[in-house]
């Protein structure tokens, strides 16, 4: 994902009839004007803000990469939700790209978990039942998997 968020520039709005501690904030879907007096809407499909804020700019919407599908579009209050295509997954330690799921387990192991958009297939040793972090499966004996379909946000 190319998360093109603008730096969340913040400011303190001028003190004018502050009836509440949060009067200088704008609602989700907006950002504050430079003089701190007005709230300006984010542009639908282009940028967004998710919380009450004093940002000078809304955050730019994420564009889903090739190899990803768009689960839900960007609105003025929520970023795009992207998900890895079927047969690929995104790991927590390498969230920048979708990796191909393994097609099966190494010899002596059985598959206990399917490929999902956020996890590779899960293999355990037949006897001990311990998990295998595993690289490539052994050529001789593989158990094929069917890709899973649950949704996972990756913004």
């Amino acid at each position: 994902i190319t998360q093109q968020d603008l730096a969340p520039q913040q400011r303190v709005a001028p003190q004018q009839k502050r009836s509440s501690p949060s009067e200088g904030l704008c609602p989700p879907g907006h950002h504050i004007s430079e003089d701190g007096r007005d709230c300006i809407s984010c542009k639908y499909g282009q940028d967004y803000s998710t919380h009450w804020n004093d940002l000078l700019f809304c955050l730019r919407c994420t564009r889903c990469d090739s190899g990803e599908v768009e689960l839900s579009p960007c609105t003025t209050t929520r970023n795009t939700v992207c998900q890895c295509e079927e047969g690929t997954f995104r790991e927590e330690d390498s969230p920048e790209m979708c990796r191909k799921c393994r097609t099966g387990c190494p010899r002596g192991m059985v598959k206990v978990g399917d490929c999902t958009p956020w996890s590779d297939i899960e293999c355990v040793h037949k006897e001990s039942g311990t998990k295998h972090s595993g690289e490539a499966p052994a050529v001789e004996e593989t158990v094929t998997s069917s890709p899973g379909t649950p949704a996972s946000p990756c913004s």
Partner: antibody
Framework: QVQLVQSGAEVKKPGASVKVSCKAS????????LHWVRQAPGQGLEWMGW????????KYNEKFKDRVTITADKSTSTVYMELSSLRSEDTAVYYC????????????WGQGTLVTVSS | DIQMTQSPSFLSASVGDRVTITCRAS??????VAWYQQKPGKAPKLLIY???TRHTGVPSRFSGSGSGTDFTLTISSLQPEDIATYYC?????????FGGGTKLEIK
């Protein structure tokens, strides 16, 4: 169902103040912004300000800033709009209206409260 | 403040007619425009937001279009129950402002 029920009509003298209430029901009070919009007889609509019960955020239209005060009682899910130093041109129907925490359009409106300012 | 200029102010049309109301903003408001219908003695009702998105329960004969400064509300086939005053509103920058209204009458 969502309801915004406003207080009854008021007749006030110039220079006086008026306080109009708007009781919300049918939704979670702290999740929506409540606004006040007024409409003078035969005229268009004019946004006055908002109150967000979720964080007590208040914003006023600069035009009314010195004369309007918006408050709320969360225990009764009621928002109030007080307008002071009334003049004849403040004669109008005052509406409360609701908006989700996003784009500033109003999906539900109260029935309106007629405030007449006359000596 | 952004001025919203509606035209025409009054419009007379027959049942079944295609009716178009326009709204011009004094500066660019992107697509942040809503349309409301108001019947005499009643509160306004939301019809359209984000210039072209119909609110829940609004008949498909109502449609909106436009971006930047020029916006249009269209009723594809006028029905007797559509007799009302219609208002545009910009929700781009506070203070949010409304057009002066278009009163729609049956010929």
């Amino acid at each position: 169902q969502v309801q915004l029920v406003q207080s009854g009509a008021e007749v006030k003298k110039p220079g006086a103040s008026v306080k109009v209430s708007c009781k919300a029901s049918g939704y979670t009070f702290t999740e929506y912004i409540l606004h006040w919009v007024r409409q003078a007889p035969g005229q268009g609509l004019e946004w006055m300000g908002w109150f967000y019960p979720g964080n007590n955020n208040i914003k006023y239209n600069e035009k009314f800033k010195d004369r309007v005060t918006i408050t709320a009682d969360k225990s009764t899910s009621t928002v109030y709009m007080e307008l002071s130093s009334l003049r004849s041109e403040d004669t109008a129907v005052y509406y409360c209206a609701r908006h989700e925490q996003g784009p500033g359009y109003f999906d539900y409106w109260g029935q309106g409260t007629l405030v007449t300012v006359s000596s | 403040d952004i001025q919203m200029t509606q035209s025409p102010s009054f419009l007379s049309a027959s049942v079944g007619d295609r009716v178009t109301i326009t709204c011009r903003a004094s500066q660019d408001v992107n697509t942040a425009v809503a349309w409301y219908q108001q019947k005499p003695g009643k509160a306004p009702k939301l019809l359209i937001y984000w210039a072209s998105t119909r609110h829940t329960g609004v008949p498909s004969r109502f449609s909106g279009s436009g971006s930047g400064t020029d916006f249009t509300l269209t009723i594809s086939s006028l029905q007797p129950e559509d007799i009302a005053t219609y208002y545009c509103q910009q929700h781009y920058i506070t203070p949010w402002t409304f057009g002066g209204g278009t009163k729609l009458e049956i010929k």
